[in-house]
C-alpha cells in the first residue's frame, strides 16, 4: 500500500538543529546562515501503529538515504540508532515496531515517543554538539520537544 510521506527538518525547542555525526549518529547543535544546509532532512512517513487519541504513528527516515531511526535494546537500555534498510522495501505501511514513533503534536510542538519502548522519547541534551538519544524522562533537563519545518526539494 502507498505511504503518505513528507520532507522536513526538525529543531529542538532550544532551536538546535540535527546534523549527521559519523555514519550512524545524529547530534544537535545551533546552526546559522549557510551552515543550516548541514541539517538532516527527514522523510517522515505515516505508518500503521497502535491507536491513541493524540498519537500518530510515523517513521523517520533520512531523505535519499537508506537509513531510519530505530529503537533497540543495547546493554538492557532502550537506545536510538540509525539503521540501514533495503531501499526497495522502505518506507512501507507496516513498519517493524522498532522504526515506529508515536508523534504527539500539541500547539505546533512535536514529541516522538518510541512505539517499542513507551515513555521513551527522541531527546537532545541542553549541551551543544551532543548525540540525539532515546530518553526515558520528559520535562526534565533533556529536551523532548521539537518543531518541524517542511523542506522543498
Amino acid at each position: 500500500a502507498p505511504v503518505r510521506s513528507l520532507n522536513c527538518t526538525l529543531r529542538d525547542s532550544q532551536q538546535k538543529s540535527l546534523v549527521m555525526s559519523g555514519p550512524y549518529e545524529l547530534k544537535a547543535l545551533h546552526l546559522q546562515g549557510q551552515d543550516m544546509e548541514q541539517q538532516v532532512v527527514f522523510s517522515m512517513s505515516f505508518v500503521q501503529g497502535e491507536e491513541s487519541n493524540d498519537k500518530i504513528p510515523v517513521a523517520l527516515g533520512l531523505k535519499e538515504k537508506n537509513l531510519y531511526l530505530s529503537c533497540v535494546l543495547k546493554d538492557d537500555k532502550p537506545t536510538l540508532q540509525l539503521e540501514s534498510v533495503d531501499p526497495k522495501n522502505y518506507p512501507k505501511k507496516k513498519m517493524e515496531k522498532r522504526f515506529v514513533f508515536n508523534k504527539i503534536e500539541i500547539n505546533n510542538k512535536l514529541e516522538f515517543e518510541s512505539a517499542q519502548f513507551p515513555n521513551w522519547y527522541i531527546s537532545t541534551s541542553q549541551a551543544e554538539n551532543m548525540p540525539v538519544f532515546l530518553g526515558g524522562t520528559k520535562g526534565g533537563q533533556d529536551i523532548t520537544d521539537f518543531t518541524m519545518q517542511f523542506v522543498s526539494s
Epitope: 500500500a1 502507498p2 505511504v3 503518505r4 510521506s5 513528507l6 520532507n7 522536513c8 517522515m44 505515516f46 491507536e51 491513541s52 487519541n53 493524540d54 500518530i56 510515523v58 505501511k93 508523534k103 503534536e105 505546533n108 512535536l110 518543531t147 518541524m148 519545518q149 517542511f150 523542506v151 522543498s152 526539494s153
Partner: antibody, heavy 119, light 108 residues
C-alpha cells in the same frame, strides 16, 4: 488568529482552466499541511488533495492529472490549478488546514469560493 | 478506495432528543475517523477526531464512538443550534481521505 481566505473562483467554460488561491494568516505554511475540499451545489463534501512540502502532494484518484496543488510559503498562499474543467467540477472549493501532521482531519476552513463550469 | 456510508440520510428530531448517526467504512479504518457539522452556506466545522476525541470548543453533548468499520456520532440532548448536516470522514487508511455522503438533521 487563524484565517484562511480563498479567491479566484468564477465562471469558466468547459475545457478551460482556473487557478484558485488560499491565503492564510495566523500560522505558517512551513509547518502545516493544507488541503482542498469541494462541494457541488446541494451535494456532500469531496476531498481533492493535500500538500505537505512542495514535493509531497496527494490527490483523490479522480483529481490526479487534472488538478495540481502548490504553495508559496513566502506569500502564505496555497494554490489549486484546475485544468480540462467539466460541468461536474462546478462546486464551492474550500481550503482547509490539517489539524496535525498526518491527522487527516481539518480544524480550520476558509469560507469557500464558487467555481461554475458552464458554456 | 475506501467508501464511507452514513445512515440515515435525513433525520427528524426535536429539541431535547438524543440522536445517533451511524457511519460505516467499506473496510477497517482503525480509529481514523472524524465528524464535521455544516450549516447552509458555511464551511464545515470539526467536531470529533480519532473517532472519540472532542475538538476544541465543541460542547460535551456531542460524543463519538466506534473503531474498525462502524462508528457513531451521538448528540445527547439536541439544541436548536444543532440542526445541520453532519459528515463523517476517513482520515487515515493510506493516501485517500474520504467523506460520507452526509446526514441532514432537521426539526421534526
Amino acid at each position: 488568529e487563524v484565517q484562511l481566505v480563498e479567491s479566484g473562483g468564477g465562471l469558466v467554460q468547459p475545457g478551460g482552466s482556473l487557478r484558485l488561491s488560499c491565503t492564510v494568516s495566523g500560522f505558517s505554511l512551513s509547518s502545516y499541511a493544507m488541503s482542498w475540499v469541494r462541494q457541488a451545489p446541494g451535494k456532500g463534501l469531496e476531498w481533492v488533495g493535500i500538500i505537505y512540502d512542495s514535493a509531497s502532494t496527494y490527490y483523490a484518484s479522480w483529481a490526479k492529472g487534472r488538478f495540481t496543488i502548490s504553495k508559496d510559503t513566502s506569500k502564505n498562499t496555497v494554490y489549486l490549478q484546475m485544468n480540462s474543467l467539466r460541468a461536474e467540477d462546478t462546486a464551492v472549493y474550500y481550503c482547509a488546514r490539517e489539524r496535525a501532521i498526518f491527522s487527516g482531519d481539518f480544524d480550520y476552513w476558509g469560507q469557500g469560493t464558487l467555481v461554475t463550469v458552464s458554456s | 478506495d475506501i467508501v464511507m456510508t452514513q445512515s440515515p440520510s435525513t433525520l427528524s428530531a426535536s429539541v431535547g432528543d438524543r440522536v445517533t448517526i451511524t457511519c460505516q467504512a467499506s473496510q477497517s479504518i482503525s480509529s481514523y475517523l472524524s465528524w464535521y457539522q455544516q450549516k447552509p452556506g458555511k464551511a464545515p466545522k470539526l467536531l470529533i477526531y480519532r473517532a472519540s476525541t472532542l475538538a476544541s470548543g465543541v460542547p460535551s453533548r456531542f460524543s463519538g464512538s466506534g473503531s474498525g468499520a462502524e462508528f457513531t456520532l451521538t448528540i445527547s440532548s439536541l439544541q436548536p443550534d444543532d440542526f445541520a448536516t453532519y459528515y463523517c470522514q476517513n482520515t487515515g487508511g493510506g493516501i485517500n481521505i474520504a467523506f460520507g455522503q452526509g446526514t441532514k438533521l432537521e426539526i421534526k
